[in-house]
Amino acid sequence: MVPEEEPQDREKGLWWFQLKVWSMAVVSILLLSVCFTVSSVVPHNFMYSKTVKRLSKLREYQQYHPSLTCVMEGKDIEDWSCCPTPWTSFQSSCYFISTGMQSWTKSQKNCSVMGADLVVINTREEQDFIIQNLKRNSSYFLGLSDPGGRRHWQWVDQTPYNENVTFWHSGEPNNLDERCAIINFRSSEEWGWNDIHCHVPQKSICKMKKIYI
Amino acid sequence: LGEPQLCYILDAILFLYGIVLTLLYCRLKIQVRKAAITSYEKSDGVYTGLSTRNQETYETLKHEKPPQ
Amino acid sequence: LGEPQLCYILDAILFLYGIVLTLLYCRLKIQVRKAAITSYEKSDGVYTGLSTRNQETYETLKHEKPPQ
């Protein structure tokens, strides 16, 4: 037979049990509180650091792009995609039509100064978007050149040159000495590409990735 | 309401629910332990009569309305 | 981790905590009910001896290890 507990011992046991249970409760509540605090405070710190990052990102661009036009991407209030204010946006890129006349090298330099490159056209849809903003009586440099004059065309951003996604005018390219590509309008074929001498000043099209802040 | 705001509201509700339930659970746990001790005391001394303290505990267990 | 992702993770933690505690609470509540019924039966028929079922309940109440 088990020796009987004294009421005093039972009181003591109950007291210890209560202490243990309430300690557990306190620990649980503390853990919950930590969880909740993390959930509430971290996002604000996150938002703060995100804001700081955004501001420094904006400062980076401010030198050449004093103002940005931003649109909200998706549902999340935190994600904005921006293009410099005079630029136009299409899909994940921003485009700028430079009306200043420059040689191909200078046009590329001009784009790079703005954090962009001469335009690389990857799809028919992209070209169709770009031509909406072009003047028919002008020619515009593309980010496409053949530096060696051996018909090894290359895009400025190292995108592989795909013969199947090119929009040359018929009969073009036609001159090994013409090592830079332009887009221009021909009444017979509408808009298409042509090879020309790189040193002859033309207008140009710059393209940059959207700025995500 | 935006998606993130909704998430924080849900956080707050779940947090409060967690706290309330933790407190209720611990309270019940202690009551169960007390009930066990009371039970033991009752089986040990049926002829001695119930002390007020034990009666109280019994009453609590018997008539306590379950939390909704 | 992104801000909303963090919120959802914490939501999940709090949600799971709530579910687990709700289950534990309900389990304990049921045990308390059973204990109350057992208590009543015991006080009503002291000379009839404890049935196995009651003994089990008693044992459960007596020796149950408190959940951590």
Partner: antibody, heavy 120, light 107 residues
């Protein structure tokens, strides 16, 4: 070696048109480069007036846009300047110049220049 | 249009001296600057392009420098044939404009 030679009347009356010819030897104007007209005023200030490219397109200085025209005759390897409604302010030495040398970094080939005086 | 401001408008120097002519652009011209020398009754002659590259045949006593908007042409140990008018011209964006010229005379 490429050589450029300007020719045209040395005296033009105000409100009339000034017409000059640049004859190019040693290089075909349809092969490459762009072909400019540059003038130098009596005070030595130089001004780029405009050009015609090897493929025949034009660009003009905005200050002259509605008065200037640059054309060419590819069979003669010549290009021309026509400046309408001249005033005494248009008195200058006119040069034809090849553009695009050194990756368009400087004008390396100039004609010897022709002085045009606008006077009644 | 980018404006080019050249200074001084004129300067006198002796043979053997070193002179510096400066040119300021109204905007960044990214080193696309040329220097010309013009003798009396002749057409301008290109000396320097891309701010610092000497044209073949130009004596090494000529040197170009600068960046952004500020550029200069330095002539070490002046020779009698160096006297004349010097012009700068930017080649960044059409229209390519010239500085007003610096008349270098023998003292």
């Amino acid at each position: 070696d490429v050589q450029l030679q300007e020719s045209g009347p040395g005296l033009v009356k105000p409100s009339q048109s000034l017409s000059l010819t640049c004859s190019v030897t040693g290089y075909s104007i349809t092969s490459a480069y762009y072909w400019n007209w540059v003038r130098q005023f009596p005070g030595n200030q130089l001004e780029c007036m405009g050009y015609i490219t090897y493929d025949g397109s034009n660009n003009y200085n905005p200050s002259l846009k509605n008065r200037i025209s640059i054309t060419r005759d590819t069979s003669k390897n010549q290009f021309f300047l026509k400046l309408n409604s001249v005033t005494t302010e248009d008195t200058a030495t006119y040069y034809c110049v090849r553009g695009g040398d050194y990756d368009d970094g400087g004008f390396a080939y100039w004609g010897q220049g022709t002085l045009v005086t606008v006077s009644a | 249009d980018i404006q080019m401001t050249q200074s001084p408008a004129s300067l006198s120097a002796s043979v053997g001296e070193t002179v510096t002519i400066t040119c300021r652009a109204s905007g960044n011209i990214h080193n696309y600057l040329a220097w010309y020398q013009q003798k009396q009754g002749k057409s301008p002659q290109l000396l320097v392009y891309n701010a610092k590259t000497l044209v073949d045949g130009v004596p090494s006593r000529f040197s170009g420098s600068g960046s952004g908007t500020e550029y200069s042409l330095k002539i070490n140990s002046l020779q009698p044939e160096d006297f004349g008018i010097y012009f700068c011209q930017h080649f960044w964006i059409i229209p390519y404009t010239f500085g007003g010229g610096t008349k270098l005379e023998i003292r």
